[in-house]
């Protein structure tokens, strides 16, 4: 079970243009929160470790996944060619 | 930070080619698409296209033909407006188009006028 | 013809008032969530407040809440202050292989009594 977290925002830095969220999961041995169909869900923590994040799948269906350049994240490509991108930090 | 600017908007005559450009910094094209979004004076916010970060560019149905979205860089995507009219009278703002459009640019005027 | 009707287009509240704002959408926005919310002042850009029509885009107050799904959203800004007086937008997303991939309703002007 998992649930969106907002993180509260540091003062101290400048504002964000990327919303800084997390998912708080309850998961068992061997899994970590992560996303699968664009939705926050326990994963398998060697997904997380090596970053292939697209074996998470995390793109919802008919969406294609890539992974950007140094495996920072990924992309999910929508059927009709729109681009949504996600960084891990 | 992560920011964009327009430039090239500028008094032009009816049927005059134009060209704006949009430069972007911190973050990277190849990461992420941008749409172009104009306002006429006074009016509401209206969608011309986007270029998603593999080049693909996509347009409102309206703008077709007329507007032409391209990268012409790795920091510059530039929106190309043939046979302006004064309809076409605007603030031309471009913005990183993710989840939501965030952050946009200040916006250029663009005033078609004989 | 890709239609996103907003109501009302002006309103006035009072500081420390709710008000709400609605975007209806003519077919359903890509995964029923696809909506944004921006708030414009003028000789501004716009501002993200929302996307994915409830989640709060980073460093905008809790005061302003989103809510809906497919074709019907609303906007709630509730505990009114001065600073909220601008004009609010709804944006949605649609699926480019069909139609325009981006709308704008038509703006609603918030007016502080």
């Known amino acids: 079970t998992c649930e969106i977290v907002t993180l509260d925002r540091d003062s101290s830095q400048p504002r964000r243009t990327i919303a800084r969220q997390t998912a708080r999961c309850a998961c068992r041995k061997g899994q970590i929160a992560g996303t699968t169909r664009a939705r926050p869900a326990c994963v398998d923590a060697r997904i997380i470790k090596t970053k292939q994040w697209c074996d998470m799948l995390p793109c919802l269906e008919g969406e294609g996944c890539d992974l950007l350049i140094n495996r920072s994240g990924w992309t999910c490509t929508q059927p009709g060619g729109r681009i949504k991108t996600t960084t891990v930090s | 930070q992560e920011q964009l600017v327009e430039s090239g908007g500028r008094l032009v005559t009816p049927g005059t080619t134009l060209t704006l450009t949009c430069t972007v910094s911190?973050?990277?094209?190849?990461?992420?698409?941008v749409s172009w979004v104009r306002q006429a004076p006074g009016k509401g916010l209206e969608w011309i296209g986007y270029?998603?970060?593999?080049?693909?560019p996509h347009y409102a149905s309206w703008a077709k033909g007329r507007f032409t979205i391209s990268k012409t860089s790795s920091t510059t995507v530039d929106l190309k407006m043939t046979s302006l009219t004064t309809e076409d009278t605007a603030t031309y703002f471009c913005a990183r188009d993710n989840y939501g459009m965030d952050p946009w640019g200040p916006g250029t005027l663009v005033t078609v006028s004989s | 013809e890709l239609d996103l009707t907003q109501t009302p287009s002006s309103v006035s509240a009072a500081v420390g008032g709710t008000v709400t704002i609605n975007c209806q959408a003519s077919q359903s926005v890509y995964n029923n969530k696809n909506l944004a919310w921006y708030q414009q002042k003028p000789g501004q850009p716009p501002k993200l407040l929302i996307y994915a029509a409830s989640t709060l885009a980073s460093g905008v107050s809790s005061r302003f809440k989103g809510s809906g799904s497919g074709t019907q959203f609303t906007l709630t800004i509730s505990d009114v202050q001065c600073d909220d007086a601008a004009t609010y937008y709804c944006?949605?997303?649609?699926?480019?292989?069909?139609?325009?991939?981006?709308?704008f309703g038509g703006g609603t002007e918030l007016e502080i009594l």
């Open positions: 911190g973050f990277s094209l190849s990461s992420y698409g």
């Open positions: 944006q949605g997303e649609f699926s480019c292989s069909s139609a325009d991939c981006n709308a």
């Open positions: 270029i998603a970060n593999n080049y693909n």
